[in-house]
Interface confidence: low
């Protein structure tokens, strides 16, 4: 998968956001960075400017390391993909914001309204924050 | 070699919907994003949107939110774009495109809307 | 949603002249796409990542620029590169284009 028409080789957009809650778990799916593997042959290993913080599996999920309040000094950072046998290297941004919270009043106007707000996050169309498949 | 067809040109009534197939062949449908994009006579280019049939995920232009429905079928290797509720400024050529550096298209389909 | 401007709108230049199309983005994006498309053709990609040569594209084309100004060079010119020329983002959805440059040969 890649760029516009043509799958170019590379991730598939420049930047990828996700919206967090406060609190970040340890080992928390965020999103999904899969690389855009056009040709099927190559062989990528994924790195993040921020290991204390942030992993990528080989599927390209990015995960927590750990638990922390997620707050600006986590909230761009980079990832890393490399050909294992050419060495060719590209990277993204990643940028995390911050889930609004409801004050007491709004939860009190709608009992419904966290259903709203909090959806499950993996479901069908959500994007990035879908598992491949193999 | 890698090839896009797409389906023939359409001739729809203001209101209506329409599809438009995309068949890949060529290469794993699978391996690669989808994008639709069209382009009114005489205008520039515009990005209406992806699928991803890898994992059946989809990227919409917001413009065309609520009338825009991208799926594939990969047991045929084919993309879908449906856009309904059509204006007659939906017509345009549409484009479906996918592919790996050497930047493939479909041939163009022509959607008029006229009453 | 994210504004690309080029500039000129047509440029008119003799075979072998040198060519420069202008992109201007309403925002910082991170890189640049060029397209080309001839009357009754789909457009074909020239250059990714603002500055690599898709393959197959002669290099008489180059890219460059970076943050919200970018430019698609064709260092001399062929009668057969007369075409419009579209620049693209990805940055921000939804991935825009700019409205077009047409290169007319004399």
């Known amino acids: 998968s890649g760029e516009i028409a043509l799958c170019k080789t590379g991730f598939p957009e420049d930047v990828y956001s996700a919206v967090l809650s406060k609190d970040v778990h340890e080992g928390q799916p965020l999103l999904n960075v899969k690389f855009s593997n056009c040709n099927g042959k190559r062989k990528v290993q994924y790195e993040s400017s921020e290991p204390a913080d942030f992993k990528v599996d080989e599927d390209g999920m990015v995960y927590a390391v750990r638990s922390f309040p997620l707050s600006s000094e986590h909230a761009k950072f980079l990832i890393y993909a490399q050909d294992k046998e050419t060495q060719e290297k590209w990277q993204v941004a990643v940028k995390l914001s911050l889930k609004p919270t409801l004050t007491e009043e709004s939860v009190k106007e709608s009992a419904e309204v966290e259903e709203i707000v909090f959806p499950r996050q993996f479901s069908k169309h959500s994007g990035h924050l879908q598992r491949q498949k193999r | 070699q890698v090839q896009l067809v797409q389906s023939g040109a359409e001739v729809k009534k203001p209101g209506a919907s329409v599809q438009v197939s995309c068949k890949a062949s060529g290469y794993t449908f699978t391996s690669y994003l989808m994008h639709w994009l069209r382009q009114a006579p005489g205008q520039g280019l515009e990005w209406m949107g992806y699928?991803?049939?890898?994992?059946?995920?989809?990227k919409y232009n917001e413009k065309f939110k609520g009338r825009v429905t991208m799926t594939s079928d990969t047991s045929i290797s084919t993309a879908y774009m449906e856009l309904s509720s059509l204006r007659s400024d939906d017509t345009a050529v549409y484009y479906c495109a996918g592919g790996d550096y050497e930047d493939y298209w479909g041939q163009a389909t022509l959607v008029t809307v006229s009453s | 949603e994210l504004v690309l401007t080029q500039s000129p709108g047509t440029l008119s230049l003799s075979p072998g002249e040198r060519a420069t199309l202008s992109c201007r983005a309403s925002?910082?994006?991170?890189?640049m796409y060029w397209y080309q498309q001839k009357p009754g053709q789909a457009p074909r990609l020239l250059i990714y990542?603002?500055?690599n040569l898709a393959p197959g594209i002669p290099d008489r084309f180059s890219g460059s620029g970076s943050g919200t100004d970018f430019t698609l060079t064709i260092s001399s010119l062929q009668p057969e590169d007369a075409a419009t020329y579209y620049c693209?983002?990805?940055?921000?959805?939804?991935?825009?284009f700019g409205q077009g440059t047409k290169l007319e040969i004399k």
């Open positions: 693209q983002q990805f940055s921000s959805p939804p991935f825009t």
């Open positions: 699928i991803n049939p890898y994992i059946d995920v989809t």
């Open positions: 925002s910082s994006v991170n890189y």
């Open positions: 990542y603002t500055s």
